[in-house]
């Protein structure tokens, strides 16, 4: 039994880091493998992660962490029974994938303005709370070409757009994702999408 693709890990910078790897053949990850991880710190304890299958030869493990600090460094040991298959390290702050925003809501009752709001996925005491920026994707269910991205570079988890920038009388969907420049993170997954019917009053023409 050998590791074909070494584990790569990403952290949500709060409580979970996810590591994925591939074995050289079909493997029952949960029964055959264990991933041990330990914060490099005096008296810190080693923890064991039981991996799940992720395709035939792929494994994924969700490492639980009480908290994350920028200088944290973890040792990782992948075991098959008594055999050490791979040894490495992981610095969560260098491999951050933020949590996806939640509670995306479209408010359509504000005088021909669409107000989109969502929730920051981090608590206020987390470093990323004040460092997230967002991308909002809006698309038409009827017209695949009607697809747009709005970059929200301010901290407020909201976006205002004129309803008239979208077509009237049809349904749209929106979703939002996050990233943090400070840690050069990857983008989060998209939030669940929300749907609304776009309608607004056409302005009367003056003659």
């Amino acid at each position: 039994m050998k590791v074909l693709q070494e584990p790569t890990c990403v952290s949500d910078y709060m409580s979970i880091s996810t590591c994925e790897w591939k074995m050289n053949g079909p493997t029952n990850c949960s029964t055959e493998l264990r991933l041990l991880y330990q914060l490099v710190f005096l008296l810190s304890e080693a923890h064991t992660c039981i991996p799940e299958n992720n395709g035939g030869a792929g494994c994924v493990c969700h490492l639980l962490m009480d908290d994350v600090v920028s200088a944290d460094n973890y040792t990782l040991d992948l075991w098959a029974g008594q055999q050490l298959l791979w040894k490495g390290s992981f610095k969560p702050s260098e491999h951050v994938k933020p949590r996806a925003p939640g509670n995306l809501t479209v408010h359509t009752n504000v005088s021909d303005t669409l107000l989109l709001t969502w929730s920051n996925p981090y608590p206020p005491d987390n470093y990323l709370y004040n460092h997230l920026t967002y991308a909002v994707n809006i698309w038409s269910e009827n017209d695949p070409a009607d697809f747009r991205i709005y970059n929200v570079t301010y901290l407020e988890p909201s976006l205002r757009i004129a309803a008239s920038t979208l077509k009237s009388g049809i349904s749209y969907r929106a979703r939002v994702r996050a990233w943090a420049q400070c840690y050069n993170t990857t983008w989060s997954e998209w939030s669940p999408s929300t749907k609304w019917h776009n309608s607004y009053r056409e302005p009367f023409e003056q003659h």
């Epitope: 490099v40 710190f41 200088a71 460094n73």
Partner: antibody, heavy 120, light 110 residues
Framework: EVQLVQSGAEVKKPGASVKVSCKAS????????MNWVRQAPGQRLEWMGT????????GYNQKFKGRVTITVDKSASTAYMELSSLRSEDTAVYYC?????????????WGQGTTVTVSS | DIVLTQSPDSLAVSLGERATINCRAS??????????IHWYQQKPGQPPKLLIY???NLESGVPDRFSGSGSGTDFTLTISSLQAEDVATYYC????????FGGGTKVEIK
């Protein structure tokens, strides 16, 4: 209110041992590491060792080469530091201080200090 | 082992003026996953008091004239407006598998 109360001053002869106690109150004793730090007159702070009261795991400053032993009595919420083969340069104020892994070892409460004098 | 060198050894500052204390580590600390920096204040005859943890986090109850910054090998404790009660010796501390203290900086009033 969090309190760490240490035992009283000690005068010892070279070659003897000293055992200093640190009684904790006002928090859950097993939730925090307990550290021992000493300070010789006019000198910098010097870490001696740390114990995790939850499982009695210990880590020591190798400078003391087995002369220091840190223990806990969980039922009494008390930590102990014993230093053996005392020499005159061990004359110092000895402090206990608690720390939290979440804060990565920052010592937020300290005992009042115990003066140990080693003199023939 | 990491060695922490504080500068200056002593510092005389007028009341209301800024005091800046430096702490240099012999190896990169926070940017390399190599540990954590904290700052303490110690007054004569008293145990140390935690001021700043994890480089730049103010401990509860500590006045906000104290702040910490830095990365890599260089860290700084700043007192933005020195008060009489700030006269003390200040220590930086590095922690990972060992705990190390700097040599201390004595702050006095000019």
């Amino acid at each position: 209110e969090v309190q760490l109360v240490q035992s009283g001053a000690e005068v010892k002869k070279p070659g003897a041992s000293v055992k200093v106690s640190c009684k904790a109150s006002g928090y859950t004793f097993t939730d925090y590491y307990m550290n021992w730090v000493r300070q010789a007159p006019g000198q910098r702070l010097e870490w001696m060792g740390t114990i995790n009261p939850y499982n009695a795991g210990t880590g020591y400053n190798q400078k003391f080469k087995g002369r220091v032993t840190i223990t806990v009595d969980k039922s009494a919420s008390t930590a102990y530091m014993e230093l053996s083969s005392l020499r005159s340069e061990d004359t110092a104020v000895y402090y206990c201080a608690r720390s939290l892994l979440r804060r990565r070892g920052a010592m937020d409460y300290w005992g009042q200090g115990t003066t140990v004098t080693v003199s023939s | 082992d990491i060695v922490l060198t504080q500068s200056p050894d002593s510092l005389a500052v007028s009341l209301g003026e800024r005091a800046t204390i430096n702490c240099r580590a012999s190896k990169s600390v926070s940017t390399s996953g190599y540990g954590y920096i904290h700052w303490y204040q110690q007054k004569p005859g008293q145990p140390p008091k935690l001021l700043i943890y994890l480089v730049d986090n103010l401990e509860s109850g500590v006045p906000d004239r104290f702040s910490g910054s830095g990365s890599g090998t260089d860290f700084t404790l700043t007192i933005s407006s020195l008060q009489a009660e700030d006269v003390a010796t200040y220590y930086c501390q590095h922690i990972r598998e060992l705990y190390t203290f700097g040599g201390g900086t004595k702050v006095e009033i000019k």
